[in-house]
């Protein structure tokens, strides 16, 4: 039940973040969603949270990005590998995270 509430809250944050296209959305971040198919949810959440934590250093930390980081961290492994070479914009990262979260919400 708590898992579903957290996912729902994450989706709301992603909905409002992806509606906008401010300067921060152009930030380059690691494309952490190119992981193998068998990667666990907790590993994916950890990777996504790590990307969000790195955004803090760019003066792009609004309340929704902070909330996303908090919520993802609460469901994630404490550590994870971050050896991706590929990059994406923050906007694309958030759009892809939204698709992943919607799939998880409707599956539960």
């Amino acid at each position: 039940h708590n898992f579903n509430i957290t996912i729902k809250e994450i989706i709301k944050m992603l909905n409002i973040l992806t509606a906008r296209n401010d300067s921060c959305m152009e930030l380059t971040v690691k494309d952490v969603f190119t992981a193998p198919k068998n990667t666990s949810d907790k590993e994916i959440f950890c990777r996504a949270a790590t990307v969000l934590r790195q955004i803090y250093t760019h003066n792009c930390s609004n309340r929704y990005l902070r909330g996303l980081y908090r919520n993802l961290s609460s469901m994630a492994n404490k550590t994870c590998s971050m050896n991706e070479i590929k990059k994406s914009t923050l906007k694309d990262f958030l759009e892809r995270l939204k698709v992943i979260m919607q799939k998880k919400y409707y599956r539960h």
Partner: antibody, heavy 116, light 109 residues
């Protein structure tokens, strides 16, 4: 202290043009989306347009798209609304507002009256 | 584009609790915002992200949002709460800010 001051409201004939300005102070203007919202006499709030922090990216309500243009000059901490082909139904108080994911600061508004 | 429906008017007795609703398809999937507007004044943000209050807004004002209805609750109503109240959401598909039609709250007594 955050302040937004709108100017430029006037009486104008249908088909005429007007440019509204909104001067911002008390915050880093270039770091925020800004919006224009209007309110016809005795009516509710209607969002008009918004512009991203660095300019360029704009959105408009269907009722004004193609007639109104929102812009900003971050060096002057000023937001603009160019209003062309004005109609009687554009008569309203026009507010500018800071948009920090929620319209958290508003100006006092400027009255635009479109009438012959 | 999203459509948000509010009752045009709501009355409450002094000291009692008033609820103002804002109905919209799947509004619970979006964040709801609420504004208070007194005559001759600009609107003021009183609730953001469904239920959070900006600093300076009294605890008597609270918000909730579920499925198709967002609700603003004013407990222990005071004379100064008499005003117009507007809900607002972000419409993702239209990339637009959408307001409800507004509700006039009358405080009786």
């Amino acid at each position: 202290e955050v302040q937004l001051v709108e100017t430029g409201g006037d009486l104008v004939e249908p088909g005429g043009s007007l440019r509204l300005s909104c001067v911002a102070s008390g915050f880093t203007f270039s770091g925020y989306y800004m919006s224009w919202i209007r309110q016809a006499p005795g009516k509710g709030l209607q969002w008009v347009a918004d512009i991203r922090d660095s300019g360029g990216n704009t959105h408009y309500a269907d009722a004004v798209r193609g007639r109104f243009t929102i812009s900003r000059d971050n060096a002057k901490n000023t937001l603009y609304l160019q209003m062309d082909s004005l109609r009687a139904e554009d008569t309203a108080v026009y507010y500018c507002a800071r948009d920090d994911w929620g319209l958290d600061y508003w100006g006092q508004g400027t009255l635009v009256t479109v009438s012959s | 584009q999203s459509v948000l429906n509010q009752p045009p008017s709501v009355s409450v007795n002094l000291g009692k609790t008033a609820s103002i609703t804002c109905e919209g398809d799947n509004i619970g999937d979006k964040y709801a915002f609420w504004y208070q507007q007194k005559p001759g004044q600009a609107p003021v943000l009183i609730i953001y992200d469904d239920s959070k209050r900006p600093s300076g807004i009294p605890e008597r004002l609270s918000g909730s949002n579920s499925v198709n209805t967002a609700t603003l609750t004013i407990s222990g109503a005071r004379a100064e709460d008499e005003a117009d109240y507007y809900c607002q959401v972000w419409d993702n598909s239209a990339k637009a800010i959408v307001f409800g039609g507004g509700t006039h709250l009358t405080v009786l007594g």
